[in-house]
Interface confidence: low
């Protein structure tokens, strides 16, 4: 709130702390049930008993942690990504499904492909979809690897998206891609599987193009129908969208203030 | 500052607009002075008559448009930041330089090399060093082509500094890549001569690696020894730094309010 | 966005930027700047009513969290949000410089 | 920076990042949240002196003017610079529902 | 302006049923939450329940097994259904709306009607 | 559940007296606390919430103050028409919301 008045300008009056945590602490209520569209805390009556489901603690745990790659948050646009996103995530189709046997082994390439019918279960429209991140677990790694990723196109052709270089290391370290764009396309068309090429960097005279970084969900010869899944640790996109029924809310209000 | 009673946090006394543009304004004046670490206007006794000279008018513009590649301002660091940098601008050693001779001719790639006794002329110390661009005129362009710049390392190793995917374009256009850290060590190093290599982004599958972007500076053969430079628009640093004297004033004055 | 699009052809009495150009001659008496000549500065201006009262419906007070008190904060502020440098050109000496000073034009504000 | 390492081990008077820990059941009274149990939410206090005033000795002024009124603003205010989110489990009905929540922990603050 | 009127209140016997109503008007009925309070004669007042304006409702302990409270936003209209009446009971019972600005002060009791008395005697 | 102590359950007091009544949480209730006036065959009327925050209308001689357990109402002044029983609540997701007992302000 402006103050108009020189004297406020340059003196400040003493601070009850206690006041303005309070303060703080009563908007922080407000900010959380807005954030949410709630009017007020949700009843908990159907909660069923025990602790959180395994799922949904992992689910917890890679949004909470920060990632290799993932950059601090953006500064947001300010209506839509005010509000709360729900976070999903959908896991990459199991390796000895049909859909690898397309694609030749290869010493420089790795192939992850994901069914859009779960990514629509997940996020019905692609409008509501405000983050898409790739998160590969990268084991341990010997030599220094410029990897580079690529998104399916048609007629098997692949688009270069980004890159990354990754330092060697001892224990394993999940790597994120922000593929937002692409996943919203995905949500846009009608293909039933769509997919990513995690591929060694090849410089035009380079003669070694071989991808050293050993990706979990596949065992070190790549070989996609010999592939060994480690639990839930494969390869996984985690969704961050608006739900459906908080978009609608949010269509409807579209006024300024 | 904090405003500690509850009636100024939810209500707003009238707003003199003109008694807080006169604020601003005053503001302002001490910000621009204090940013430059002047305590008064500069003395105009011995500035010379007549226009601004032509470089100084093309390093202003330089500096004043935003080009393609270019990210908006980041969030400065808050003290070094927020002093004035000042703005220099050091061309592309010249193409009949022996020192395109070591490096073959290739239909991937250009090179370009700097002097880096003008990088230290214009930069004293690497600390002072905020951001350093290299800028290039890329002329006309026909197909969407992928490049990456890479940095000469020592035995005319190359490594990979970034990417960029450029548009099919009838105008030329400037493109600028951030290399700050590779000027800084340059800075640091003993060496001469240092340079940069822009190539077309080669897959390991792929077969056309030609660079069709022609960049202002190059003749479209890309020979070296032939190569006309047209004018100023050859490939440049353009560079941030706080001056020496601002830095000096700064170290001494390292302590906190 | 409370950016100068939406504020500089709306009446918005809360937070918004402010136009505000500065000619260096005639506001500040400065002849020492050779280029520019001025610059659109602009500020932030309006009040971010703190919406934690009675007499605010509370679907309404849902709604405008976002913008009067989108940070929570114990008494919200208008700031700028999106900011940009401004290149001079001025003379030390018989010295051309071009220097850059940042944060200097202000594009959006923010209750924050 | 006035960030959490700095203003955290000091007694800075002026504008700072302070610390401030969020328990969602002793300071909310909220039973909803299954994660986490609170957070680290802080906030930003302190005055931004206004500085560019005759009786203030000029050259400090000028050392000052980046800490009090780095944005030239007509009446600086104290308002967080870095935020960061904050990730949420709880249940609507039997579902359980993961969801980020944007710009919900301040690490550092800014007279703007 | 804001009105709350309480009504059903009388004499009824032990053990019997009871069915109190609060019609709102004023304010948007159906955006609010409220709640019933009651106070017996000369003592202090008691909290008995709250609902939401979903129809979530909770109870203090002492109310749960016999008393129910429910809601017709389409009547504007707030109900406390009373079963099993005891002597002690006897109270006068008061609706109130609840100030429920951020899910939290909506049991603050912001605005309260005027009562309606109930003496459950033999 | 949460009990609420309500000090003094009586007073006696003149026009112009500053009165002081204290309510004690048996656990810690941040600064969930409003407190009522209410006068002979009137419904209570909210004075305070939140501990400290003054309902609109209110007069300011009216002040409430504390956090935790211990929490107080102040009448800085004591005018004529401010005699009456004052009572103090607790409230807190998921718990009961509990009244003090009530304290009686009375004509010295």
């Known amino acids: 709130d402006y103050k108009d008045d020189d004297d406020k300008l340059s003196t400040s009056k003493t601070i009850d702390m206690e006041l303005v945590k309070r303060k703080r602490i009563e908007a922080i209520r407000g900010q959380i049930l807005s954030k949410l569209r709630l009017a007020s805390p949700p009843s908990q009556g159907e909660v069923p008993p025990g602790p959180l489901p395994e799922a949904v603690l992992a689910l917890y745990n890679s949004t909470r942690d920060r990632v290799a790659g993932e950059s601090a948050e953006p500064e947001p646009e300010p209506e839509a990504d005010y509000y709360a996103k729900e976070v999903t995530r959908v896991l990459m189709v199991e390796t000895h499904n049909e859909i690898y046997d397309k694609f030749k082994q290869s010493t420089h390439s790795i192939y992850m492909f994901f069914n859009t019918s779960e990514l629509r279960e997940a996020v019905p429209e692609p409008v509501l979809l405000s983050r898409a991140e790739l998160r590969l677990l990268r084991l341990k790694l010997k030599v220094e690897q410029h990897v580079e990723l690529y998104q399916k196109y048609s007629n098997n052709s692949w688009r270069y998206l980004s890159n990354r270089l990754l330092a060697p290391s001892d224990s394993p370290e999940w790597l994120s891609f922000d593929v937002t764009g692409v996943v919203r396309q995905w949500l846009s068309r009608g293909g039933e599987i769509e997919g990513f090429r995690l591929s060694a960097h090849c410089s035009c005279d380079s003669k070694d193009n071989t991808l050293q970084v050993d990706i979990n969900g596949f065992t070190t010869g790549r070989r996609g129908d010999l592939a060994t899944i480690h639990g839930m640790n494969r390869p996984f996109l985690l969704l961050m969208a608006t739900p459906l029924e908080r978009a609608q809310h949010l269509q409807s209000s579209r006024h300024r203030r | 500052d904090y405003k500690d009673d509850d009636d100024k946090l939810s209500t707003s006394k009238t707003i003199d607009m003109e008694l807080v543009k006169r604020k601003r304004i005053e503001a302002i004046r001490g910000q621009i002075l204090s940013k430059l670490r002047l305590a008064s206007p500069p003395s105009q006794g011995e500035v010379p008559p007549g226009p601004l000279p032509e470089a100084v008018l093309a390093l202003y513009n330089s500096t004043r448009d935003r080009v393609a590649g270019e990210s908006a301002e980041p969030e400065p660091e808050p003290e070094a930041d927020y002093y004035a940098k000042e703005v220099t601008r050091v061309l592309m050693v010249e193409t009949h330089n022996e020192i395109y001779d070591k490096f073959k001719q290739s239909t991937h790639s250009i090179y370009m090399f700097f002097n880096t006794s003008e990088l230290r002329e214009a930069v004293p110390e690497p600390v002072l060093l905020s951001r350093a661009e290299l800028r290039l005129l890329r002329l006309k362009l026909k197909v969407e082509q992928h490049v990456e710049l890479y940095q000469k390392y020592s035995n005319n190793s190359w490594r990979y500094l970034s990417n960029r995917l450029l548009a099919p374009s009838d105008s030329p256009e400037w493109l600028s890549f951030d290399v700050t850290g590779v000027v800084r060590q340059w800075l640091s190093r003993g060496g001469e001569i240092e340079g940069f290599r822009l190539s077309a982004h080669c897959s390991c599958d792929s077969k056309d690696n030609t660079l069709q972007v022609d960049i202002n500076g190059f003749t479209t053969g890309r020979r070296g020894d032939l190569a006309t430079i047209h004018g100023m628009n050859r490939p440049f640093l353009l560079l941030m730094a706080t001056p020496l004297e601002r830095a000096q004033h700064l170290q001494s004055s390292r302590h906190r309010r | 966005a409370l950016d100068t699009n939406y504020c500089f052809s709306s009446t918005e009495k809360n937070c918004c930027v402010r136009q505000l150009y500065i000619d260096f001659r005639k506001d500040l008496g400065w002849k020492w700047i050779h280029e520019p000549k001025g610059y659109h500065a602009n500020f932030c201006l309006g009040p971010c009513p703190y919406i934690w009262s009675l007499d605010t419906q509370y679907s309404k007070v849902l709604a405008l969290y976002n913008q009067h008190n989108p940070g929570a904060s114990a008494a919200p502020c208008c700031v700028p949000q999106a900011l940009e440098p401004l290149p001079i050109v001025y003379y030390v000496g018989r010295k051309p410089k071009v220097e850059q000073l940042s944060n200097m034009i202000v594009r959006s504000c923010k209750c924050s | 920076a006035l960030d959490t390492n700095y203003c955290f081990s000091s007694t800075e008077k002026n504008c700072c990042v302070r610390q401030l820990y969020i328990d969602f059941r002793k300071d909310l009274g909220w039973k909803w949240i299954h994660e986490p149990k609170g957070y680290h939410a802080n906030f930003c206090l302190g005055p931004c002196p206004y500085i560019w005033s005759l009786d203030t000795q000029y050259s400090k002024v000028l050392a000052l003017y980046n800490q009090h009124n780095p944005g030239a603003s007509a009446a600086p205010c104290c308002v967080p610079q870095a935020l960061e989110p904050l990730p949420i489990v709880y249940y609507v009905g039997r579902k359980p529902k993961v969801e980020q929540l944007s710009n919900m922990i301040v690490r550092s603050c800014k007279c703007s | 302006q804001v009105q709350l009127v309480e009504s059903g209140g009388g004499v009824v016997q032990p053990g019997r049923s009871l069915r109190l109503s609060c019609a709102a008007s004023?304010?948007?009925?159906?955006?609010?939450?409220m709640n019933w309070i009651r106070q017996p004669p000369g003592k202090g007042l008691e909290w008995i329940g709250y609902?939401?304006?979903?129809?979530?409702?909770y109870r203090a302990n002492w109310a749960r097994g016999r008393f129910t409270i429910s809601r017709d936003n389409s009547k504007n209209t707030l109900y406390l259904q009373m079963n099993s009446l005891r002597a002690e009971d006897t109270a006068v019972y008061y609706c109130?709306?609840?100030?429920?600005?951020?899910?939290?002060?909506?049991?603050?009791?912001?605005?309260w009607g005027q009562g309606t008395l109930v003496t459950v005697s033999s | 559940d949460i009990q609420m102590t309500q000090s003094p359950s009586s007073l006696s007091a003149s026009v112009g007296d500053r009165v002081t009544i204290t309510c004690q949480a048996s656990?810690?209730?941040?600064?969930?606390v409003a407190w009522y006036q209410q006068k002979p065959g009137q419904p209570p009327k909210l004075l305070i919430y939140a501990a400290s925050t003054l309902e609109s209308g209110v007069p300011s001689r009216f002040s409430g103050s504390g956090s935790g357990t211990d929490f107080t109402l102040t009448i800085s002044s004591l005018q004529p028409e401010d005699f009456a029983t004052y009572y103090c609540q607790s409230y807190s997701d998921g718990d009961s919301v509990i009244f003090g007992q009530g304290t009686k302000v009375e004509i010295k």
């Open positions: 656990q810690r209730i941040s600064t969930y």
């Open positions: 109130a709306r609840g100030w429920h600005i951020f899910g939290h002060h909506y049991w603050v009791m912001h605005f």
């Open positions: 609902i939401y304006t979903t129809g979530t409702t």
């Open positions: 004023g304010f948007h009925f159906s955006n609010e939450a």
